[in-house]
Interface confidence: low
Amino acid sequence: DPLPTESRLMNSCLQARRKCQADPTCSAAYHHLDSCTSSISTPLPSEEPSVPADCLEAAQQLRNSSLIGCMCHRRMKNQVACLDIYWTVHRARSLGNYELDVSPYEDTVTSKPWKMNLSKLNMLKPDSDLCLKFAMLCTLNDKCDRLRKAYGEACSGPHCQRHVCLRQLLTFFEKAAEPHAQGLLLCPCAPNDRGCGERRRNTIAPNCALPPVAPNCLELRRLCFSDPLCRSRLVDFQTHCHPMDILGTCATEQSRCLRAYLGLIGTAMTPNFVSNVNTSVALSCTCRGSGNLQEECEMLEGFFSHNPCLTEAIAAKMRFHSQLFSQDWPHPTFAVMAHQNEN
């Protein structure tokens, strides 16, 4: 996939920033707001931030600029720079009236068919598990194979460096074709097939990618919020995987929830399958020692481990992946829509 150019975005924060720089009032306000960061810590939802008057004034100035509605894209060039601008501007939106975080990512959904050649899979035993088959599909694709080998190398060995491993994982889930990435991670296993389940759980190399000692979940979130990319991915996940009703209907679409979920892999908030016998997922963190924030901690943890929208989105994608191999397709090469709306 070619990376989206700025011009393909409705209102890229990079473009808006350049426009702002050409206007002395806007430029001064942006710089001032940027310097306000240290004096305004990101408050907990229960706290009111105390904001210096000059920062409020700068925020007010920016509210009239094109920066205020700017967005970024998950696969754009200079994504981190774009997100940096987004979160600086976000303060202008939220100062004075604490606003819940809004995903910085614009949804540019492409519906390009994904060509898969299943005939090459005949080198596998017919009864091979689907996780093995999806791994083979990745191997048969040059780009997927190259990206997978890169993170496999970075994440293996007794002395793997976690930060390097995470960076390569992030790159894989960002640059590999979405159906390949989803097939690899969300491959279905028979309930009693522990080998398949173990293969799936090990897809993201948890021994290296996940912290050796589970940190407190709120500490993990604090760490995540200090990084524009991680913060963006977490907010995107909370936006698109929010259950809207008791049936677990997602706030937007299941496909967007899954994209947001995969976007977290390689960040500080990397989730994974909990065991090799089911499809439950969780963050690698604990709520022990949360004191009077126990409830807030459990809510964060529950957004991963007890989220009916996410559970149903994963289950639907796995059903879809099962069908790919269970049906008699007319030709060994067939096209599958890359972005299914499975709601």
């Epitope: 009703d245 126990q294 943890e301 529950g302 989220n307």
Partner: antibody, heavy 123, light 107 residues
């Protein structure tokens, strides 16, 4: 400590109305869906109604639809059940409940319960 | 609506016995099932959530298992305070439904 305290139960004639309240404390009330469940004397448990944390979504059992209305006041941490056109078969202890923090997304979970309030419909 | 069939409706046992109560759903409810204990004149109390997870503060003699349509509540070594009524409840599908209850009586 999380607490739910129901009130408003009483003896009422068929066709009459009653308003039950459930006062909550010890948790962030607006983050949680709240549910009413009832139990007729000597019988099992029956789900009555659920309201989302914001109050924008409400759900009712077929047996009470059109007669009962669930609502909440997040500024007072209270959930209400307005019962109209009461029938003898509505006689029951009415409990309010909520999911635990771990399962706040599962609106239909009932991890914490109040002590209940008795509604008797009889002439 | 999903029907929850609980069996037996009542059982008699001795203190120290191991008892099993089953709950069958009319269709697949994954692991979205809870078990409650209710003492006479009291509100129900949550024992097991998501089929097999023990609520905090609940004695370890209680255990839950199952997924799909068949679920089991097991009480190992019955204590005098366990001779009460037990209910299952599904929350996989709207509306939520309860089993009819199982009354555990002392022999």
């Amino acid at each position: 400590e999380v607490q739910l305290l129901e009130s408003g139960g009483n003896l009422v004639q068929p066709g009459g109305s009653l308003r039950l309240s459930c006062a909550a404390s010890g948790f962030t009330f607006s983050s949680y869906a709240m549910t009413w469940v009832r139990q007729a004397p000597g019988k099992g448990l029956e789900w009555v109604s659920t309201i989302s944390g914001s109050g924008t979504s409400t759900y009712y059992a077929d047996s009470v639809k059109g007669r009962f209305t669930i609502s909440r006041d997040n500024s007072r941490d209270t959930v209400f059940l307005q019962m109209n056109s009461l029938r003898a078969e509505d006689t029951a202890v009415y409990y309010c409940s909520k999911p635990s923090a771990l399962r706040f997304l599962h609106w239909l979970c009932m991890d914490v319960w109040g002590q209940g309030t008795l509604v008797t419909v009889s002439s | 609506d999903i029907q929850m069939t609980q069996s037996p409706s009542s059982l008699s046992a001795f203190v120290g016995d191991r008892v099993t109560i089953t709950c069958r759903a009319s269709q697949d409810i994954r692991n979205y099932l809870d078990w409650f204990q209710q003492k006479p004149g009291k509100a129900p109390k949550s024992l097991i959530y998501a089929a097999s997870n023990l609520q905090s503060g609940v004695p370890s003699r209680f255990g839950g298992s199952g997924s799909g349509t068949d679920f089991t509540l097991t009480i190992n070594s019955l204590q005098p305070e366990d001779f009460v009524t037990y209910y299952c409840q599904q929350y996989n599908s709207y509306p939520p439904t309860f089993g009819g209850g199982t009354k555990v009586e002392i022999k």
